[in-house]
Interface confidence: low
């Protein structure tokens, strides 16, 4: 559940976060899965932990496997995986799917092509662009941070595009590049007023103590390119991350799908070891946009276990 | 502990502009949306608009369409609130407000006078 | 845009006193109504969000309750620190719209 895929190309720098979150002071240990072998944390090494980050300086294919991370906190540990993969470079221009990162979609109005994972990395301005291999050149293209403006976007400008850059470290420069493409929408999008599919308004969600709890508030907001759209999780009023319970976390990042072309967000609750307190809260699920907000409020109630003895 | 602090009071002439700075500490400043609303003398209270610290996009109040500009600068946990074409009628408290529907943390205001 | 229509604009009241607050918007905003408490030359403070559900910090004596269109705010025994100026937002389509407000006075 807690795992997460990442990839990269060998010799190239590749930096991976552990998929479970913990507050800056958590210590954070790295284990190589098959053998349990603890991920050193010296700088020295090519392949070297340091805290929630995994650094492989630079990556080789035989990097390739599933590593461990485990979030220590005085009261709780959370385990996560990532499944690494390191692929040899191509010989050719043409990347494959496997090394594609997410597709972005743009209209004449909103063009920017962000450059994947590239927060992980310390790097230093201006990104280098390249579509379908080539060096874009031209004042239509604009390297502004970590992003590309296309200026006046138009069908031809589909295709796929990598960014490449330089990560730093202790002195030593490494390559990195990420590809991912990009598609120009000829249709006009719209919004709506949110709708929230999931939960159902005054849902009563049947949770066992001592178990783990999701909950999930799925909300769609029209059709393409939405603005100010947002779905999230508010305990008794609170938002999450103020909340300030370890045991109750939002699920890190908002996936945007596309059901019969609506444009949709979901946002996991994720509620561990269920205890009694948490039947008295009050869970909203709040779908944002710019018409306007919309909230469907749960509650946990006990599921009796089945009393074999009766 | 969260905090919003905004710029301090300012006097301008009419048709002149008005741009207001509001400071989050204490949290996460791209996972709120930041509202501003006015209050002037006397009266009640006014929604001017929103933005999303994350994005940058806004969503203004019909009234001041046109007028009105709010922008953030995410280096520094920031965000402005122009207002163009001032008239006598735009003097108010100008609040910076944090939340989604609620607005549950509340800079301390911003009192600007036009006068000519 | 939503009207939020608040009664009464003002009150008089006595400590101990039990006060009510309605507010009435021009359509259904389902539960997405609050109330806020302001005292002169301060910023609002919020009460009560989603109608009835009590702001962390905000004294138990506070209570709201409706859905729909009509809304009602409660303070169960008035104390001296709650006389104030109070408005009822919703929150369920922007622009977001205040009502008029009430002030609560001494009697």
């Known amino acids: 559940k807690f795992s997460k895929q990442s990839w990269g190309l060998e010799n190239e720098a590749l930096i991976v976060r552990c998929p479970r979150q913990g507050k800056p002071s958590y210590t954070v240990d790295w284990y190589y899965s098959q053998t349990n072998k603890s991920i050193p944390t010296q700088e020295r090494n090519r392949v070297f932990a340091s805290g929630q980050l995994l650094k492989f300086l630079p990556a080789a294919v035989a990097d390739s496997g599933i590593y461990t991370c485990i979030v220590r906190s005085p009261t709780f540990n959370r385990t996560g995986y990532a499944n690494v993969t390191i692929y040899k470079k191509q010989s050719d221009c043409n990347v494959p799917d496997y090394l594609m990162y997410s597709t972005v979609s743009g209209s004449e109005k909103n063009s920017k092509i962000y450059c994947p994972t590239i927060d992980l990395y310390n790097w230093t301005a201006p990104l280098e662009w390249f579509k379908n291999c080539q060096a874009l050149q031209g004042s239509r293209y604009r390297a502004h941070k970590s992003f590309l403006v296309i200026d006046n976007v138009m069908t031809e400008d589909a295709g796929d595009y990598t960014c490449k850059f330089i990560h730093n470290e202790n002195g030593a420069n490494y390559s990195v590049t990420a590809t991912r493409s990009f598609t120009v929408k000829d249709e006009q999008g719209f919004s709506l007023f949110p709708v929230i599919g999931a939960p159902a308004q005054n849902e009563i969600k049947e949770v066992e103590i001592g178990k783990n709890a999701n909950l999930t508030c799925s909300a769609c907001f029209g059709k393409g390119t939405q603005f100010l759209a947002a779905v999230l999780w508010q305990l008794n009023g609170t938002k999450i991350t103020d909340f300030g319970e370890p045991r109750i976390q939002q699920e890190e990042g908002q996936n945007q799908s596309f059901s019969n072309g609506l444009a949709c967000l979901d946002m996991v609750l994720r509620i561990a070891d269920v205890k009694e307190e948490d039947l008295l809260l009050q869970y909203d699920c709040l779908a944002l946009n710019l018409h306007g907000l919309r909230r469907h409020t749960v509650r946990l109630s006990r599921k009796n276990p089945i009393d074999h003895h009766s | 502990q969260v905090q919003l602090v905004q710029s301090g009071a300012e006097v301008k002439k009419p048709g002149a502009s008005v741009k207001v700075s509001c400071k989050a500490s204490?949290?996460?400043?791209?996972?709120?949306?930041m509202h501003w609303v006015r209050q002037a003398p006397g009266q009640g209270l006014e929604w001017m608009g929103i933005?999303?610290?994350?994005?940058?996009?806004?969503s203004y109040a019909q009234k001041f369409q046109g007028r009105v500009t709010m922008t953030r600068d995410t280096s520094t946990s920031t965000v402005y609130m122009e207002l163009s074409s001032l008239r006598s009628e735009d003097t108010a408290v100008y609040y910076c407000?944090?939340?989604?529907?609620?607005?549950?943390?509340w800079g301390q205001g911003t009192l600007v006078t036009v006068s000519s | 845009d939503i009207q939020m229509t608040q009664s009464p604009s003002s009150l008089s009241a006595s400590v101990g006193d039990r006060v009510t607050i309605t507010c009435r918007a021009s359509?259904?905003?389902?539960?997405?109504l609050n109330w806020y408490q302001q005292k002169p030359g301060k910023a609002p403070k919020l009460l009560i969000y989603?109608?009835?559900s009590l702001q962390s910090g905000v004294p138990s004596r506070f209570s709201g309750s409706g859905s729909g269109t009509d809304f009602t705010l409660t303070i169960s025994s008035l104390q001296p620190e709650d006389f104030a100026t109070y408005y009822c937002?919703?929150?369920?389509?922007?622009?977001?719209?205040f009502g008029g407000g009430t002030k609560v006075e001494i009697k």
């Open positions: 407000a944090r939340g989604v529907g609620a607005t549950n943390y």
């Open positions: 937002q919703q929150g369920f389509n922007f622009p977001l719209t």
């Open positions: 359509q259904g905003i389902s539960n997405n």
């Open positions: 989603a109608a009835s």
């Open positions: 204490g949290n996460t400043f791209t996972a709120y949306y």
């Open positions: 933005i999303n610290p994350s994005g940058g996009s806004t």
